[in-house]
């Protein structure tokens, strides 16, 4: 569904822009502390990232601009949840599973930050 | 901990080799079906991948060679679990969280398969 793909990409780009624009507003609370993963394997930490976003949302005075930002982040979360559903939907033959496992291991080997 | 990093890379490489070598043994069960994610965002599907490995392990007659393969996969799983623990260990300032969030969104934008 290329349209949906294009829409998500646009949404992420817009969110990055809003994040840049409203940094000062967002980091207003100097005492607030939020969980930040200690590594760069972002996809492993989806839950914690969105918990952090919720903490930020609850601690920030909402203006219209920030409302759009948090709304975008919520839509991104919905998309990710859909992707997570697709992890277990398809039951395939052992051959296909082995091909996927081989690829997964290659990804760990080349792309993951595996220190520590 | 570069030593540990090097060890994991070696472990993953050895596992890939074992997987290639023992494909025929592994795919013996023609009727067995295993969940295969419908997309390439592997890190979102860790749980399902290792559930699939367990299914395969329980359905396969264990020889010494296969024992090593499944042992390796179990060690890789342990490492990933350690990484997952590190998602929520560090409580940092908003500034650092925003930096991480920005990086996460950039990764979605450039690296994820976000079709459909």
């Amino acid at each position: 569904i290329p349209k949906q793909s294009a829409t998500l990409r646009a949404l992420v780009r817009e969110t990055l822009t809003l994040l840049s624009t409203h940094r000062t507003l967002l980091k207003g609370n100097e005492t607030l502390r939020i969980s930040v993963p200690a590594h760069k394997n972002h996809q492993l930490c989806i839950e914690e990232i969105f918990q952090g976003i919720d903490t930020l949302k609850n601690q920030t005075t909402q203006g219209e601009a920030l409302a759009t930002l948090f709304q975008n982040l919520s839509l991104i979360k919905k998309h990710i949840d859909l992707q997570k559903q697709k992890c277990g939907e398809e039951r395939r033959r052992v051959k296909q599973f082995l091909d996927y496992l081989q690829e997964f291991l290659a990804v760990i080997n080349t792309e993951w930050t595996i220190e520590g | 901990i570069p030593k540990q990093s090097a060890t994991l890379r070696a472990l993953v490489r050895e596992t890939l080799t074992l997987l290639s070598t023992h494909r025929t043994l592994l795919k013996g069960n023609e009727t067995l079906r295993i969940s295969v994610p419908a997309h390439k965002n592997h890190q979102l599907c860790i749980e399902e991948i290792f559930q699939g490995i367990d299914t395969l392990k329980n359905q396969t007659t264990q020889g010494e060679a296969l024992a090593t393969l499944f042992q390796n996969l179990s060690l890789i799983k342990k490492h990933i679990d350690l990484q997952k623990q590190k998602c929520g260990e560090e409580r940092r300032r908003v500034k650092q969280f925003l930096d991480y969030l920005q990086e996460f969104l950039a990764v979605i934008n450039t690296e994820w398969t976000i079709e459909g």
């Epitope: 395939r92 033959r93 051959k95 296909q96 091909d99 081989q102 690829e103 | 419908a38 997309h39 079709e115």
Partner: antibody
């Protein structure tokens, strides 16, 4: 938009080899498998194999194993299908097709490349 | 290898007719079947995947059904642009295999 553009028609002698290219654009090349399918004149479709551009892992239809070689060049987002020891019955249109997900349906097809094997 | 048997191999129909093509797999392929349309001299085009899921942009007059071994493609009201050859494809197991095709001609 997502596109697969194949190389032009080829005429080859029996015993020779042919290498057909398939250039991908409009998406992240390493995120989707590329399948190869052929169609002899007036005949149906036949699957040759697939390659995963992420890790170069390929899988072949036993019928073509040893004669077909699937490769990719990630730097140019191009997939290749080489067929060796050509015989007249290899005369066909060769298509590349993108896999939508993992071992999923073919959502985008190349325009096809006619390979003629004739002495 | 899984054999895919398609029937009929050809049929003649008029615009507005309801057309049904069937495909039988030699073993259980779950729902991993797609229907492909090909017009003369053109590249194939996938219409339906996972047995009954219509691909974006494909007219709703096309529908698919079935699971296991028996599958059906239905065109509810044949249009002039639907005259083509239709193939089923199983992508449940390697090697992927196609049906021999059904040519839909104008009566």
């Amino acid at each position: 938009q997502v596109q697969l553009v194949q190389s032009g028609a080829e005429v080859k002698k029996p015993g020779a080899s042919v290498k057909v290219s398939c250039k991908a654009s409009g998406y992240t090349f390493t995120n989707h498998h590329i399948n190869w399918v052929r169609q002899a004149p007036g005949q149906g479709l036949e699957w040759i194999g697939y390659i995963n551009p992420y890790n170069d892992y390929s899988r072949y239809n036993q019928k073509f194993k040893g004669r077909a070689t699937l490769t990719v060049d990630k730097s140019t987002s191009t997939a290749y299908m080489e067929l060796s020891s050509l015989r007249s019955e290899d005369t066909a249109v060769y298509y590349c097709a993108r896999d939508y997900g993992n071992f999923w349906y073919f959502d985008v097809w190349g325009q096809g490349t006619l390979v003629t094997v004739s002495s | 290898d899984i054999q895919m048997t398609q029937s009929p191999s050809s049929l003649s129909a008029s615009v507005g007719d309801r057309v049904t093509i069937t495909c039988k797999a030699s073993q259980d392929i779950n729902s991993y079947l797609s229907w492909i349309q090909q017009k003369p001299g053109k590249a194939p085009k996938t219409l339906i995947h996972r047995a009954d899921r219509l691909i974006d942009g494909v007219p709703s007059r096309f529908s698919g059904s079935g699971s296991g071994q028996d599958f059906t493609l239905t065109i509810s009201s044949l249009q002039p642009e639907d005259f083509a050859t239709y193939y089923c494809l199983q992508y449940d197991d390697f090697p992927y295999t196609f049906g021999q095709g059904t040519k839909v001609e104008i009566k």
